[in-house]
Amino acid sequence: IWELKKDVYVVELDWYPDAPGEMVVLTCDTPEEDGITWTLDQSSEVLGSGKTLTIQVKEFGDAGQYTCHKGGEVLSHSLLLLHKKEDGIWSTDILKDQKEPKNKTFLRCEAKNYSGRFTCWWLTTISTDLTFSVKSSRGSSDPQGVTCGAATLSAERVRGDNKEYEYSVECQEDSACPAAEESLPIEVMVDAVHKLKYENYTSSFFIRDIIKPDPPKNLQLKPLKNSRQVEVSWEYPDTWSTPHSYFSLTFCVQVQGKSKREKKDRVFTDKTSATVICRKNASISVRAQDRYYSSSWSEWASVPCS
Amino acid sequence: RNLPVATPDPGMFPCLHHSQNLLRAVSNMLQKARQTLEFYPCTSEEIDHEDITKDKTSTVEACLPLELTKNESCLNSRETSFITNGSCLASRKTSFMMALCLSSIYEDLKMYQVEFKTMNAKLLMDPKRQIFLDQNMLAVIDELMQALNFNSETVPQKSSLEEPDFYKTKIKLCILLHAFRIRAVTIDRVMSYLNAS
């Protein structure tokens, strides 16, 4: 058993049918010695008396808010949560496996640049009695500071019969140098509590591996005289790291017909312009990627050919 | 990435082309190592990230873009020792910091070259003959060093009398390649920045 926060405790249980559970001793936070009784949640049934209460915690029915009273007055509370260990592996009931980029990915994180700011998000089908708390650091043995905000509900989607809820959090490394070569990964830890169930999820990454630039901005077409060709031009996104001559991007320009089946023409360039043939009803799209370290491509920025 | 590559015109900053070749070569070598050594811990998540140049060179600090010198987090350990400029610089444009930056890059390359050559000698003794260093990568390191043209003491190749532990050598190869790829990215950024300046 360990303390999650003041008056909230997590009991770790080896979770299998007929398991013996864990013996837990609760102590009433009071100078009083006599006439103390204990109850669980809203029930008035007295579970025991005395300054300490010994309980055998086996199932969720044994978890909850234990209260010690004296003469009708509440003295203190202890909330017991359960953390299930199923065959040597901590349970992951609360969050959905996003399966991207690999199986058992519960937290996904992205950064728009090298400033040390990043966003993580996760999915759940649970809509109520759910709280999250996020901590982060650079490295784990001698951790350096990363400050995270509060997790917020960022999207709701309908998937088949289920509603899916997306939560996200923004974090910022306290003293980040965009040019630094990372040798210690960022660690992100999310505590999730649903009703009386506690779970924790972690992700470990280098900022360089989670970079996904914003799409190029100011995408424009300039028709070339007496030709079906157009000059496409664009600019680096505002959110990208500067100077751009150091933090360079590479670009992919795509000409896509109206039908998805039509052949796509693609050109790769390090410049911020390209000359392409603009077909009728086609659209031109451009996306960006770090020129030197192949992390994710940005989303496409698009303009119609007409 | 197998993308079309524009060849730099002769008037360009001479080292940019070499540094691009270097990044391509080390990335290819790392990919090959990860595939060949699939039963070894060779992914970024599995290895310890060690930098053999730590406390010996200070490339990131010495080559910091001017715009980032205002960022206190980037200014932990700026080097101040003076080193003669190399041939990548048009001499009139030579600045003290630029010379320092390029000499630091040269020292990095020299250290990695020695490590890779020592390692290759061990890998050639492996009865499994599982993996060797790409000669193209070693050649590209050499080319960039020559382009930088710094006069520096030659570091003798390390020789070891004891029987090599091939498992450990292959893991060390992965660690070295990961670190060298990160350094090659920094070198490429620096060359691109200097070229634009």
Epitope: D14, W15, Y16, P17, D18, A19, E59, F60, K85, E86, D87, G88, I89, D93, K102, N103, K104, T125 | F39, P41, E46
Partner: antibody
């Protein structure tokens, strides 16, 4: 004490369907994940499928994906395996099993797929 | 499709020490715990070892398990006639959990 009693096995022709049941008692069935494991005659153990305690997630072996469906009725304390498009290579003793460091197995039920 | 490899058979005379190996990889045994089962003819498997080296109550202390790196082993010190059975190791793969990975199985024969 924990008990898992299986039923529903038998002889069936290739291409036909069969449903296996596993009735649980002696524990809070709705709190635990459950597996199906099979063993072809004279062969080793092969995992077939898993279902979470609340039925929200199901996992299958590639060899049965799209043909077998694992389900549970927590109000009846029963686990099911619906098997469709059966093949000769599905012939085996099928076991249900609880998920956890200490597990409990059903007695097994024989499924024979033969024309 | 078995990823955990066991010797097909091992044998010993009563009182001898018998060991069964179970060889896997970094994504399974290397990053998960190992169980061992005993299966007597015509019966369901019985748990002998969980969590690499833990014995459930009721399992004789002549059975012991260990794990090192990407392989595990089961030892029977002072093998007895009633130990003649098939033995299976089981683990998980970190990418496909909770799918169970079973070993190929080992037939233990007690001679004499």
């Amino acid at each position: 004490q924990v008990q898992l009693v299986q039923s529903g096995g038998g002889v069936v022709q290739p291409g036909r369907s069969l449903r296996l049941s596993c009735a649980a008692s002696g524990f809070t069935f709705s709190s635990y994940g459950m597996h199906w494991v099979r063993q072809a005659p004279g062969k080793g153990l092969e995992w077939v499928a898993f279902i979470r305690y609340d039925g929200s997630n199901k996992y299958y072996a590639d060899s049965v994906k799209g043909r077998f469906t694992i389900s549970r009725d927590n109000s009846k304390n029963t686990l099911y395996l619906q098997m469709k498009s059966l093949r000769a290579e599905d012939t085996a003793v099928y076991y249900c099993k609880t998920h956890g460091s200490h597990d409990n197995w059903g007695q097994g039920t024989m499924v024979t797929v033969s024309s | 499709s078995y990823v955990l490899t066991q010797p097909p058979s091992v044998s010993g005379t009563p009182g001898q020490r018998v060991t069964i190996s179970c060889s896997g990889g970094r994504s399974n045994i290397g990053s998960s715990t190992v169980k061992w089962y005993q299966q007597l003819p015509g019966t369901a498997p019985k748990l002998l070892i969980y969590g690499n080296d833990q014995r459930p109550s009721g399992v004789p202390d002549r059975f012991s398990g260990s794990k090192s790196g990407t392989s595990a082993s089961l030892a029977i010190t002072g093998v007895q006639a009633e130990d003649e059975a098939d033995y299976y190791c089981q683990s998980y793969d970190r990418g496909t959990h909770p799918a169970l990975l079973f070993g190929t199985g080992t037939k233990v024969t007690v001679l004499g």
